[in-house]
């Protein structure tokens, strides 16, 4: 059974994951982002089901394409580069989903834009956090 300290750690990791996903989304949605139209042409795979931490496997598998799309921003001055954000998200995802069991991700038939994709995983984090508090 999960202890209160392990639940607290999971909650904190989910909150950090949520914050960085929201940060990426905010940067993309910035009305001054000239690359937004191009970014929206890229399609992402969505999970058929995302209700448990093991389903983060589906997010992990899409992190490389996400980084590639974020690289389109090509800002002269990054406080944080796309690879910094994706690297941190990857570390959190690996810790949250665990590596003991191998879960085969099932994807929905319909693909999604980067905005829809990020919103889906933001909702996932919020949903799991709500069950822990």
């Amino acid at each position: 059974a999960p202890t209160s300290s392990s639940t607290k750690k999971t909650q904190l990791q989910l909150e950090h994951l949520l914050l960085d996903l929201q940060m990426i989304l905010n940067g993309i949605n910035n009305y001054k982002n000239p690359k937004l139209t191009r970014m929206l042409t890229f399609k992402f795979y969505m999970p058929k089901k995302a209700t448990e931490l093991k389903h983060l496997q589906c997010l992990e598998e899409e992190l490389k394409p996400l980084e590639e799309v974020l690289n389109l921003a090509q800002s002269k001055n990054f406080h944080l580069r796309p690879r910094d954000l994706i690297s941190n998200i990857n570390v959190i995802v690996l810790e949250l989903k665990g590596s003991e069991t191998t879960f085969m991700c099932e994807y929905a038939d319909e693909t999604a834009t980067i905005v829809e994709f990020l919103n889906r995983w933001i909702t996932f984090c919020q949903s799991i956090i709500s069950t822990l508090t």
Epitope: L18, L19, L80, D84, N88
Partner: nanobody, 119 residues
Amino acid sequence: EVQLVESGGGLVQPGGSLRLSCAASGSIFSINVMGWYRQAPGKQRELVAAISSGGSTNYADSVKGRFTISRDNAKNTVYLQMNSLKPEDTAVYYCMYASSWYEDETDYWGQGTQVTVSS
């Protein structure tokens, strides 16, 4: 409007350590990047290190392995632990608060704190 108050600068010998702190107040959003930039005399301002509220970090190559950035989200405070300081680290260090991972005109900057590394 965001206010940034820096502290911890000073004079230190080569090989020594310093810890900078920067507290943000005002219109703070939970999703942000805080960090440190520096400007040496006659040079352009450059990134030292930055950290997101989610824990993503970025370091300048010149400080990797020597400097560590951390933050306390509850206190809206960012810290820069500087070890093995070198004379070339001498500069004015500016705290930065941004709402996005890339630089834009809505970023906020502190007044700066002087760090001098000299024997």
